[in-house]
Interface confidence: low
Amino acid sequence: SASSRRRQQSRNRSTQSQDVARVSSASDYNSSELKTACRKHELYVSFQDLGWQDWIIAPKGYAANYCDGECSFPLNAHMNATNHAIVQTLVHLMNPEYVPKPCCAPTKLNAISVLYFDDNSNVILKKYRNMVVRACGCH
Amino acid sequence: SASSRRRQQSRNRSTQSQDVARVSSASDYNSSELKTACRKHELYVSFQDLGWQDWIIAPKGYAANYCDGECSFPLNAHMNATNHAIVQTLVHLMNPEYVPKPCCAPTKLNAISVLYFDDNSNVILKKYRNMVVRACGCH
């Protein structure tokens, strides 16, 4: 019956209290493209390289990091995927030309404190929000 | 003097209270690739197309939407870029092989309510978080 079919489907699908069930994968790679899955990469940014060395006193640079990697089917638990990303992945699987894969983006960002010269050449200590990537996910 | 130089710079520059100043652009396109800038696109998702019609009673589908487009230099104000994305864009500008551009991802997500059958074939009304894209930005 339809009822028993639904129960069978329910047993087969993993449930989560808050999210649409994720399809898990043991692999950290998308085998078809051999590109690593979405993750945080280390990146040190020098303020001199950005041309900002004359107004930023300290630090000279900082560990900004960045996100990169595939958000391919199946999304694994490490990918911190939103419900929308899970839906989008399935839509992309069926219509790859129509809808892109979700993208690998920061899920946690931290601030850094910067010592700099203001408009009147006063030395100011200020916290700049969302400067450091702490975690990445599929969005 | 360095002090007067800084004052002169300050007269020429636009400042922002919370964020690293964004470089604005009137264009919604990255001229080199002719791809539109990061924005929200409309997308209706049918639960039948996803194969979920036997456990989701209502709705039959929903306006999920998705994000797509370029996060290229210069980032304009409509791109809701984080400070990190601004920094990453500049690093990519100087080292395109080393660091990717920021990606176009949801900045605002809404929930939807779904009526479905649980494991015991009970009818449940549940709110699923982060299902609908309301806004996109460069992250």
Epitope: G51, W52, D54, W55 | R13, S14, T15, V20
Partner: nanobody
Framework: EVQLVESGGGLVQAGGSLRLSCAAS????????MGWFRQAPGKERDFVAA????????YYTASVKGRFTVSRDNAKNTVYLQMNSLKPEDTAVYYC???????????????????????WGQGTQVTVSS
């Protein structure tokens, strides 16, 4: 007041080279950061390259890095853009611009900001044929 006059544009085949020059009038040339921008038909004006007051710092957009070289001669009040390995997509009007930015100035008014530049030349056409 600074006046800028570009020269050196023209028609060149893909893979070829051109050297653009920008001559500045006035004795304050060395107090300006100099930039090159370009505008293709029907498109916005885009940043290409910039050089600091002293010539010690140079900046490039990703699509030209490794192919174009920006430099300046403060004794001659001239800034140059050496363009090698030209591609059809480099076709545009190229503008020279002068602005009072430092190599270490703030985001929003540094080498990449069009608003940073106070003075602009009339432009020189570069056409790259395939």
């Amino acid at each position: 007041e600074v006046q800028l006059v570009e020269s050196g544009g023209g028609l060149v085949q893909a893979g070829g080279s051109l050297r653009l020059s920008c001559a500045a009038s006035g004795r304050t040339f060395s107090s300006y950061g100099m930039g090159w921008f370009r505008q293709a038909p029907g498109k916005e004006r885009d940043f290409v390259a910039a050089v600091s007051k002293s010539g010690g710092s140079t900046y490039y957009t990703a699509s030209v890095k490794g192919r174009f070289t920006v430099s300046r001669d403060n004794a001659k009040n001239t800034v140059y853009l050496q363009m090698n390995s030209l591609k059809p997509e480099d076709t545009a009007v190229y503008y020279c611009a002068a602005g009072r930015w430092e190599s270490g100035s703030r985001p929003g008014s540094t080498w990449y900001g069009e608003r940073t530049y106070d003075y602009w030349g009339q432009g020189t056409q570069v056409t790259v044929s395939s």
